[in-house]
């Protein structure tokens, strides 16, 4: 007599999550009578996934009319496949008794499933940074399987080399995770500069997933201030101009102070953007020499962003060379500069 | 090739919780069982139980009430936990991988952590 | 619970000369697939235990030939056909039938 054969032809099968998997399996007799079940595993933990004689098994249904006479094809369909239904699947032939005795296994099928990475979510830095500092971004994705998988960053179109990537779990698993970091080295010309994490998968045939991320969100770009006189004009009133450019973002409050005293302040609101997406924003002081006795000491204070204040201070000389006229510049941008502008009456 | 590799205290005090881990390494967690076994100092082997990788768990019913595995496939590493432990629990605690592909039986322990040393005392 | 029963429980042996150690199983371990789930380990003196052989006659990977097994049911053989100074430790025979999983009280082999 013939030896039962279990035949699953397949060592393994692979199936897009959401799609449907066939396990096949056959005998090679129809004696002795005795029904087939299906198991996930082996060993005492193994699970019942289908029992073709009796249960209620939702997602499971036999290819073939398992109570057709003479069927020697015992494969299964399983519908609407997640991760989860990864595993080493076994067609078992039982004997008929009570209870049915296990006869032979199948040399069992791994499912294997194919499930797409969810889009990249890159996120930067808590705080800005300014220009010529180093920030991190972070880009996540989850739920692929298999676990092989490409991350690329890109600046500018740019791909970036100062990246680390984990994938984890480190063994096998039913789905895996992404994350990875990217360095990025800010310029003052970052504001329109975008970062993006590419992920390539076998699931998104070709066709890679991006997350971008703005520097505009995590970049602070410093003003520069320069203060200038405009002439004197007829009526003994000095025009002087505090000049704040090249900053980024658009917050910035800026108060001119007469000998320690707030004169005036004042909050940048709807400035047109330079081209690098940087703003610029001029204010004036006019000052009446006439008014004063002694010399008096502007400063022009600018809070940009939250960040310590930038003075620059000027003094205004009210008695001496009243002809004497000019331009001063302070051009730093940090800390107190002071400058002389002399004026009085002729 | 897979690699076991048991952590945790040497020195465990009388009717404390004893505590070890096992790492594995170079292999997969899947469709093997994990299994822990203890040698008492000059004495043969004793099965304390095992873990299937899909969670389910089987002890050795002489031990079964102070005994807990778990396992965390996410990093690939399996726990012993023994509790009210006694002078009788002092032993040499190995992890290992249990093979299975024929039915309701079991095809060998076919991977084996060095074993790490258990001393109850106070 | 199966209860497992070597014999001897010390072999002195001669290098070159083949040796044989028992076990016996308190009920059978064959399997109704035809399986005997019964596992034969050896463990070298400071090592942790090594699988020889598993279902009864199938050597393990890496295992040299010239250990074998046999048995069916509850009777149950491990035959080294010519012994090496490397085969002295402790071998044990374990079932793995059903939980929870037992050992025999092992079989000392040593040189002469």
């Known amino acids: 007599e013939e030896e039962l054969q279990v035949i699953q032809p397949e060592k393994s099968v692979s199936v897009a999550a959401g799609d449907s998997a066939t396990l096949n399996c056959t005998v090679s007799s129809l004696i002795p009578v005795g029904p087939i079940q299906w198991f996930r595993g082996a060993g005492p933990g193994r699970e019942l996934i289908y029992n073709l004689k009796e249960g209620h098994f939702p997602r499971v249904t036999a290819v073939s009319d398992p109570t057709k006479r003479n069927n020697m094809d015992f494969s299964i369909r399983i519908s609407n496949i997640t991760p989860a239904d990864a595993g080493t699947y076994y067609c078992v032939k039982f004997r008929k008794g009570s209870p049915d005795v296990e006869l032979k296994s199948g040399a069992g099928t791994e499912l294997s499933v194919r499930a797409k990475p969810s889009a990249p979510v890159v996120s930067g830095p808590a705080v800005r940074a300014t220009a010529e500092h180093t920030v991190s971004f972070t880009c996540e994705s989850h739920g692929f399987s298999p676990r092989d998988i490409t991350l690329k960053w890109f600046k500018n179109g740019n791909e970036l080399s100062d990246v680390q990537t984990n994938v984890d779990p480190a063994g096998k698993s039913v789905s895996y995770s992404i994350r990875s970091t990217a360095r990025v080295l800010l310029t003052r010309r970052d504001v329109h500069s975008q970062v993006i994490c590419e992920v390539a998968h076998v699931t998104l045939q070709g066709d890679p997933l991006r997350g971008t991320a703005n520097l505009s969100e995590a970049i602070r770009v410093p003003p520069f201030l320069e203060v200038t006189q405009q002439s004197m004009r007829a009526d003994n009133q000095v025009n002087v101009t505090c000049q704040v450019t090249k900053f980024y973002p658009q917050r910035l409050q800026l108060t001119w102070l007469e000998n320690g005293n707030v004169s005036r302040t004042e909050m940048a609101s709807a400035l047109p953007e330079n081209k690098d997406g940087t703003y610029n924003w001029t204010s004036w002081l006019l000052v009446n020499v006439s008014a004063h006795r002694d010399d008096v000491k502007l400063t022009c204070q600018v809070e940009h962003d939250g960040q310590p204040a930038v003075n620059k201070s000027f003094s205004v000389k009210v008695s001496a060379h009243p002809k004497e006229q000019g331009s001063n510049t302070a051009a730093e941008n940090t800390g107190t500069n002071e400058r002389n502008i002399y004026g009085g009456s002729g | 090739q897979v690699q076991l590799q048991e952590s945790g205290p040497g020195l465990v005090r009388p009717s404390e919780t004893l505590s070890l881990t096992c790492t594995v390494s170079?292999?997969?967690?899947?469709?093997?069982?994990w299994s822990w076994i203890r040698q008492p100092p000059g004495k043969g082997l004793e099965w304390i139980g095992f873990?299937?990788?899909?969670?389910?768990?089987f002890y050795n019913p002489s031990l079964k009430s102070r005994v807990t595995i778990s396992l965390d496939m996410s990093i690939n590493q399996f726990s012993l936990k023994m509790t009210s432990v006694t002078a009788a629990d002092t032993a040499v605690y190995y992890c290992?991988?249990?093979?299975?592909?024929?039915?309701?039986?079991?095809?060998?322990?076919?991977?084996w952590g060095q074993g790490t040393t258990v001393t109850v005392s106070s | 619970d199966i209860v497992m029963t070597q014999s001897p429980l010390s072999l002195p042996v001669t290098p070159g000369e083949p040796a044989s150690i028992s076990c016996k199983s308190s009920q059978s371990l064959l399997y109704s697939n035809g399986y005997a789930y019964l596992d034969w380990y050896l463990q070298r003196p400071g090592q942790s235990p090594q699988l020889l052989i598993y279902?009864?006659?199938n050597r393990a990977s890496g295992v040299p030939d010239r250990f074998s097994g046999s048995g069916s049911g509850t009777d149950f053989t491990l035959k080294i056909s010519r012994v090496e100074a490397e085969d002295v430790g402790v071998f044990y025979c374990m079932q793995a039938l059903q939980t929870p999983l037992t050992f025999g009280g092992g079989t000392k082999v040593e040189i002469k």
């Open positions: 290992a991988r249990v093979r299975a592909y024929s039915g309701i039986g079991l095809d060998g322990t076919d991977v």
């Open positions: 170079g292999g997969s967690i899947r469709n093997y069982y």
């Open positions: 873990i299937y990788y899909n969670g389910r768990t």
């Open positions: 279902q009864g006659s």
